[in-house]
């Protein structure tokens, strides 16, 4: 008689990226018999949450039920009906509510708590919200993209069944860039991680790894436009800001408190004679570029090197994946191509960046102008904490893969938040044991 | 666990400066803000100002505007309170407290005595 | 500024017994639905420990014989059953304004 296939015995997870932009919510599926084998987990869904991020709620929390519902309800519908109870839902929040529960830990915990009574209505096995540290965020997205590039494999291969992959063992580092922070992390070469907070020792399947990391806190694209503004606006003669880092023709009215509403430009912050001012956009990628550099502090090291303010960084190593808006920023002005050397995404970026914003705006006319204004700033900033401030140089750009998915799964911390809080990466190489017997009868 | 500790009780002269340093551990330095409290004695609990170790920006109590300072090194995750043009109404215990709106951590003091 | 006015100024209590304080800002310490109020104990000798956050809160390993309630301006501490290592000054505190502000205490005895 022909072998009959039972029902699929998998598993399921949730994890939520509350962001500070936004909120994503993840859906990862994995054989059940398989937990601890890696590479078996892979992500079947994602759900971008409509709407900002989670921090922007403090004065409408009870919108807070309302902004979960459609993801939610989409993981209700993934999810087969039986398996909803056992199903675990994470909720991690990033820099924005780190950012928020700086300035209060009332509100933070507000939100938070209104997040977990909402997330609580759900069939689903929730297992609470918190706000992740940036170590972890770090951590966790290096974990994630060396587990789907099968780096944690102990079997060596013939063949490549992922992009990037060289065929060995050495992990790639992670570069991740948020609307609020940057995460930088990587394995050393045989270098000693001279600050104690930025070292993390890990032993994955029968391997340890010393791994440097850091979360650079108002160092993500948004928080380092208004620290770039914030600072800009301090020299300004007038209220009209003058600004390289947007397209000619370009205009935007800015409120001050706004502008000071954010811990990040805190040092930046005076009395100024007036409430508002007018961004003008002159596009100029290299005054662009020089405006941005000045929000790194290199004149300053206690440590045989540094990236910026003072932040150890040991000499880089290997390749590196740079996901989340590195990707994101860098995708839509075509320049993920692993062809396209330093010097020419410099070039295209002063092209890019001199290009009027009537002329843009026709050629991208399907883009919210939110997000088209702010490419030139954003590319030019990714230029500028890559090569300035993690110290790439033109020669190890092609080091770094700008990566969206890896094998279906997006890159970013989630993946990995996930397989840690399952106990789904063990410590020691499982024993390889002879094809499963329970997959047919 | 969260910890702070402060620098020793020191003795000041009328017209000098003292400055008290306060290291923290146990968390990440930059994600909290460091308040620093004062206490002269029999007194009420008085607020001076706090510090963003993030960026080194501050807001100070107008009261003793232009005469602290507050700084950080976080490469050894301290911060520093600095009151210049020391009287002797100035003498008392100074704290500093870890928060944003949310004291729940305090250092043991410092004594600080003008005369 | 808020002034914070703290009620009575000391309070003598007999173990076991109840014993509340009062604290009333000189305006509203509430924003986006949230008291901005505390709580603190302060032995001699001692940093103050936080007691109650947030109006109502309890802090981390406070006994439950702690509690706080008010909003707005009208705020209340109340140890439910006096202890002998309650003895102590007690300080309410608001967060909502610069400059934060503390009430001017209230001593705790044992009547």
């Known amino acids: 008689t022909q072998n009959k296939a039972l029902p699929e015995n998998v598993k399921y997870g949730i994890v939520l990226d509350a962001g500070s932009s936004h909120t994503s919510l993840y859906i990862y599926k994995w054989p059940a018999e398989k937990e601890n084998d890696t590479g078996v987990v892979h992500q079947v869904e994602e759900c971008r949450v409509k709407g900002p991020g989670i921090s922007k709620f403090v004065q409408k929390v009870n919108e807070i039920g309302i902004y979960l519902t459609d993801c939610m309800e989409r993981a209700r519908e993934v999810i087969p009906r039986s398996q909803h109870q056992e199903t675990p839902v994470y909720l991690g929040a990033t820099a924005g509510m780190r950012l928020l529960r700086m300035e209060s830990e009332e509100l933070a915990d507000r939100v938070l708590d209104v997040v977990e009574r909402s997330l609580s209505n759900y069939p689903f096995d929730f297992q609470g919200a918190r706000i992740i540290t940036g170590q972890e965020e770090g951590a966790y997205g290096w974990i994630t993209i060396n587990y789907l590039l099968g780096k944690f494999s102990q079997k060596t291969r013939w063949f490549s069944i992922v992009p990037y992959e060289t065929n060995n063992q050495e992990t790639f580092g992670a570069l991740d860039l948020g609307g609020a922070s940057t995460q930088v992390t990587f394995v050393p070469q045989n270098q000693t991680i001279e600050s104690p907070d930025n070292a993390l020792q890990f032993r994955l399947y029968g391997k340890d790894y010393n791994v440097y990391t850091h979360s650079f806190l108002c160092y993500g694209k948004d928080q380092a436009l208004w620290q770039k503004l914030a600072k800009d606006i301090q020299v300004a003669s007038n209220e009209i800001l003058r600004d390289p880092c947007f397209h000619p023709g370009y205009k935007k009215v800015v409120n001050v408190s706004d502008l000071y509403k954010t811990p990040c430009t805190k040092r930046f912050e005076m009395t100024l004679p007036f409430q508002q001012f007018e961004i003008q956009g002159i596009g100029n990628y290299q005054q662009c570029h020089q405006s941005i550099l000045e929000l790194f502090n290199t004149s300053y090291c206690p440590y045989s090197q540094c990236a910026f303010n003072g932040i150890f960084l040991p000499p880089l190593q290997g390749d590196f994946g740079a996901f989340s808006a590195f990707y994101f920023v860098m995708k839509f002005l075509n320049l993920t191509s692993e062809k396209v050397s330093q010097e020419k995404v410099t070039e295209m970026m002063k092209k890019f960046c001199a290009q009027p914003w009537e002329e843009i705006k026709t050629s991208y006319a399907g883009v919210k102008e939110k997000y088209l204004s702010e490419y030139c700033f954003s590319g030019t900033y990714i230029l500028s904490l890559l090569l300035q401030g993690y110290h790439f140089t033109a020669d190890s750009w092609e080091h770094i893969h700008f990566i969206g998915k890896i094998q279906g799964s997006d890159a970013g911390w989630t993946l990995g938040y996930m397989l840690n809080l399952t106990n789904m990466i063990p410590a020691e190489q499982p024993l390889s044991t002879p094809l499963s017997h329970s997959t047919y009868v | 666990q969260v910890q702070l500790v402060q620098s020793g009780a020191e003795v000041k002269k009328p017209g000098a400066s003292v400055k008290v340093s306060c290291k923290a551990s146990g968390y990440t330095f930059t994600d909290y803000n460091m308040h620093w409290v004062r206490q002269a004695p029999g007194q009420r609990l008085e607020w001076m100002g706090y510090i963003v170790p993030l960026n080194g920006g501050s807001t100070f109590n107008q009261k003793f505007k232009g005469r602290v300072t507050i700084t950080v090194d976080t490469s050894a995750s301290t911060a520093y309170m600095e009151l210049s043009s020391l009287r002797s109404e100035d003498t008392a215990v100074y704290y500093c407290a870890r928060g944003g709106t949310r004291f729940a951590y305090w250092g043991q003091g410092t004594l600080v005595t003008v005369s | 500024d808020i002034v914070m006015t703290q009620s009575p100024d000391s309070l003598a209590v007999s173990l076991g017994e109840r014993a509340t304080i009062n604290c009333r800002a000189s305006?509203?310490?509430?924003?986006?639905?949230?008291?901005?109020m505390y709580w603190f104990q302060q032995k001699p000798g001692q940093p103050p420990k936080l007691l109650i956050y947030?109006?109502?809160n309890q802090g981390s390993g406070v006994p439950d014989r702690f509690s706080g309630s008010g909003s707005g301006t009208d705020f209340t501490l109340t140890i439910s059953s006096l202890q002998a290592e309650d003895v102590a000054v007690y300080y309410c505190?608001?967060?909502?304004?610069?400059?934060?502000?503390f009430g001017g205490g209230t001593k705790v005895e044992i009547k």
């Open positions: 305006e509203s310490v509430d924003n986006f639905g949230v008291s901005f």
């Open positions: 505190q608001q967060t909502k304004e610069v400059p934060y502000t």
């Open positions: 947030g109006a109502s």
